[in-house]
Interface confidence: low
């Protein structure tokens, strides 16, 4: 038989979710998955999740990395599982910062 698609809505991907916005969940469904890193009060804050509306993700995902924030986006089930966003270094270090993973 042909590999026909199921009847269910095909546009969502399952994404790893990590961070305060995830509550007790460790996954979410969205039209894009993301992995982000930002610096808040000297801490490296890592987050992962999903953009449930494509336009919302399109804006954020196209933002080039800055010294204070980076977002990487992808489309595919759990595609953000092994993605860790990186801040642009350009030889510049951030003294006194610590890795701090928000769960």
């Amino acid at each position: 038989m042909e590999d026909e698609k199921p009847k269910v809505n095909p546009k969502l991907y399952m994404c790893v979710c990590e961070g305060l916005s995830c509550g007790n969940e460790d996954h979410c469904e969205g039209q894009q998955c993301f992995s982000s890193l930002s610096i808040n009060d000297g801490f490296h804050v890592y987050q992962k999740g999903c953009f449930q509306v494509y336009e919302q993700g399109k804006m954020t995902c196209k933002t080039p990395p800055s010294p204070g924030q980076a977002v990487e986006c992808c489309q595919g089930d759990w595609c953000n599982r092994n993605i860790t966003a990186q801040l642009p270094t350009k030889g510049k270090s951030f003294p006194g910062t610590q890795n701090f993973h928000l769960e």
């Epitope: 038989m1 199921p6 809505n9 509306v53």
Partner: antibody, heavy 115, light 107 residues
Framework: QVQLQQWGAGLLKPSETLSLTCAVY????????WNWIRQPPGKGLEWLGE???????NYNPSLTSRVTISVDTSKNQFSLKLTSVTAADTAIYYC?????????WGQGTLVTVSS | IQMTQSPSSLSASVGDRVTITCQAS??????LNWYQQKPGKAPKLLIY???NLVPGVPSRFSGTGSGTDFSFTISSLQPEDIATYYC?????????FGGGTTVAIRR
């Protein structure tokens, strides 16, 4: 994350209409099919039907004549109505969001039909 | 599409390998999910697309199969795995579930 909260009358008499509502929080209402599933005490799961944000519905053929699912996108809510209930409709009713699996569920509402 | 699940109940010891099977009445490709339901709780999605584990679900749970024959395995049964397990297809409408398999610990 997507959270579903449901409510409605828990005790009905035969021939009455079952009415339940489910509110959706923290989710893209247009991204999911919104479903109702029921489970008679001690028994398995039965899919009742679904609706999307446009109001397009699909029902279980075994219940088509009695079941209506509606949506209120302004409130991010969807509702179930089941007419002419009998004791056989006694069950826990769940609202749930479906894409490729029922990943998010309401807490369940026990509906008892008894004279 | 009818989903036939077996056995309807089983009893096993902690650490045992437990396998549940689900058979579809027609080819459903890999559009099959497995759920765990504990008493008084809503079902929880464990595996989707026949073999993909939902993150956060312990790796002792696994699923295999395609077409009409599917299986679900707990590689080493733990006390917290006591529950009823259901398969469900989403190939077509109506969406249907298997009859469930209740897993108990052998004393």
């Amino acid at each position: 994350q997507v959270q579903l909260q449901q409510w409605g009358a828990g005790l009905l008499k035969p021939s009455e209409t079952l009415s339940l509502t489910c509110a959706v929080y923290n989710g893209s209402f247009s991204s999911y099919y919104w479903n109702w599933i029921r489970q008679p005490p001690g028994k398995g799961l039965e899919w009742l039907g679904e609706i999307n944000h446009r109001g397009s519905t699909n029902y279980n053929p075994s219940l088509t004549s009695r079941v209506t699912i509606s949506v209120d996108t302004s409130k991010n809510q969807f509702s179930l109505k089941l007419t002419s209930v009998t004791a056989a409709d006694t069950a826990i009713y769940y609202c749930t969001a479906h894409t490729r699996g029922f990943l998010y569920w309401g807490q369940g509402t026990l509906v008892t039909v008894s004279s | 599409i009818q989903m036939t699940q077996s056995p309807s109940s089983l009893s096993a010891s902690v650490g045992d390998r437990v396998t549940i099977t689900c058979q579809a009445s027609q080819d459903i490709n890999n559009y099959l999910n497995w759920y765990q339901q504990k008493p008084g709780k809503a079902p929880k999605l464990l595996i989707y697309d026949a073999s993909n584990l939902v993150p956060g679900v312990p790796s002792r749970f696994s699923g295999t199969g395609s077409g009409t024959d599917f299986s679900f395995t707990i590689s080493s049964l733990q006390p917290e795995d006591i529950a009823t397990y259901y398969c469900q297809h989403y190939y077509d409408l109506p969406l249907t579930f298997g009859g469930g398999t209740t897993v108990a610990i052998r004393r």
